[in-house]
C-alpha cells in the first residue's frame, strides 16, 4: 500500500504519501477552528508510470497508452485512496462544538 | 457533472472530460483484441481550482491550501469518476470469446 | 509546537568542506521524511536533498549530486548535511524542512544557517 509506513521511508518520485502539516490560520485563513490549531493531512503525489499502483483498468491503459505515447499529456494522476477524520472543536458564540469533519487525512495513495 | 454534454460543449482549462480514441494495436500494442479495433476511452485533465468539483472535504483543503500557498505543488489532481465496461470479442485458438472488461470508459470526472 | 534549528553554516573558501545540523522537536522526526533547501540572495528556494523516515533513501539535486551527503540520526532528532567540493553558488542560506520538500515548496521553519563560499 502506497500508505506512511511505505511512502516516508522510501522517498520517491513514483505516486506516494507525502507528509503535508496545514495550519488552519496560516494555511487555509480559518480562525473559527479552537482545537486542533492544526493537522496532519497529508497528499499524494508522484508520476504514475505503467502498472504502479493502478486503480482501475482505464489508468493501466491510459498508462500504458502514455508509455508507448510519451508526447500525449493523457497520463493516470496520484491521487487519495484511504482517507479518514479530523475532530474538532470550535464555538457558536460561548458554546463549544466538537464535530467529526470526514475525509480529512489522507492514508493512503492509488494511481487513478 | 463534468461530463461529455458539458465537458465536450464548453472547452476549458479546468477539470473536464477529454475525448481519447485508443487504437488496441497502435496504442497499446494489443494484437490479442480482435473487435472493437479500437474505443472511445477518453481521460481527465484539468487543473483543480478551489472548489471546482471537489470529490472530497480533503480535496477542497488542498485547493484552499494551493490558492494560498500558490508555490506548493500539493493540488487535487482531475481524475475518473464514473467508469463504464467495454464489450470485446477475442479467440483462443479458433475459439471466440465475448468478454465484458471493467472501468475501461471514463464517462465524468471529478478533482480528487 | 513543530520546531526546526538549523545550524554549522559559516565562511568557507571554494573547494572546502562544511556540516550542517538540523535540530527538530515538537513532532515524531523518526516517522517522516526530511529535506534541505537554500535560498540564494534573490533566488526563490531551491530543493537540496530528501532523506526517507529510517535514513535508507536519498535523493540529491543534480546541482549537489556527488558533493553533498544528506544524513540523519533519529535518536537525537537531528539531520545532517555534509557539503564538500563547495563552489561560490552553493552561497545560500539553508533550511531543514519536515517533509518531501520536493512536493511542498516554499515551505521553512526555521531561520536557516548562512554558508558563504567566497575566497
Known amino acids: 500500500a502506497l500508505d506512511a509506513a511505505y511512502c516516508f521511508r522510501n522517498v520517491q518520485d513514483n505516486c506516494c504519501l507525502r507528509p503535508l502539516y496545514i495550519d488552519f490560520k496560516r494555511d487555509l485563513g480559518w480562525k473559527w477552528i479552537h482545537e486542533p490549531k492544526g493537522y496532519n493531512a497529508n497528499f499524494c503525489a508522484g508520476a504514475c508510470p505503467y502498472l504502479w499502483s493502478s486503480d482501475t483498468q482505464h489508468s493501466r491503459v491510459l498508462s500504458l497508452y502514455n508509455t508507448i505515447n510519451p508526447e500525449a499529456s493523457a497520463s493516470p494522476c496520484c491521487v487519495s485512496q484511504d482517507l479518514e477524520p479530523l475532530t474538532i472543536l470550535y464555538y457558536i458564540g460561548k458554546t463549544p462544538k466538537i464535530e467529526q469533519l470526514s475525509n480529512m487525512i489522507v492514508k493512503s495513495c492509488k494511481c487513478s | 457533472a463534468l461530463d461529455a454534454a458539458y465537458c465536450f460543449r464548453n472547452v476549458q482549462d479546468n477539470c473536464c472530460l477529454r475525448p481519447l480514441y485508443i487504437d488496441f494495436k497502435r496504442d497499446l500494442g494489443w494484437k490479442w483484441i480482435h473487435e472493437p479495433k479500437g474505443y472511445n476511452a477518453n481521460f481527465c485533465a484539468g487543473a483543480c481550482p478551489y472548489l471546482w468539483s471537489s470529490d472530497t472535504q480533503h480535496s477542497r483543503v488542498l485547493s484552499l491550501y494551493n490558492t494560498i500557498n500558490p508555490e506548493a505543488s500539493a493540488s487535487p489532481c482531475c481524475v475518473s469518476q464514473d467508469l463504464e465496461p467495454l464489450t470485446i470479442l477475442y479467440y483462443i485458438g479458433k475459439t471466440p470469446k465475448i468478454e465484458q472488461l471493467s472501468n475501461m470508459i471514463v464517462k465524468s470526472c471529478k478533482c480528487s | 509546537q513543530l520546531q526546526l534549528v538549523e545550524s554549522g553554516g559559516g565562511l568557507v573558501q571554494p573547494g572546502g568542506s562544511l556540516t550542517l545540523s538540523c535540530a527538530a522537536s515538537?513532532?515524531?522526526?523518526?516517522?517522516?521524511?526530511m529535506s534541505w533547501v537554500r535560498q540564494a540572495p534573490g533566488k526563490g528556494l531551491e530543493w537540496v536533498s530528501v532523506?526517507?523516515?529510517?535514513?535508507?533513501?536519498?535523493i540529491y539535486s543534480d546541482s549537489v549530486k556527488g558533493r553533498f551527503a544528506i544524513a540523519r540520526d533519529n535518536a537525537k532528532n537531528t539531520l545532517y548535511l555534509q557539503m564538500n567540493s563547495l563552489k561560490p553558488e552553493d552561497t545560500a542560506v539553508y533550511y531543514c524542512?519536515?517533509?518531501?520538500?520536493?512536493?511542498?515548496?516554499?515551505?521553512?521553519r526555521g531561520q536557516g544557517t548562512q554558508v558563504t563560499v567566497s575566497s
Open positions: 524542512a519536515e517533509g518531501d520538500s520536493r512536493y511542498v515548496r516554499g515551505r521553512t
Open positions: 515538537g513532532f515524531t522526526f523518526s516517522h517522516y521524511p
Open positions: 532523506i526517507g523516515s529510517d535514513g535508507g533513501t536519498k
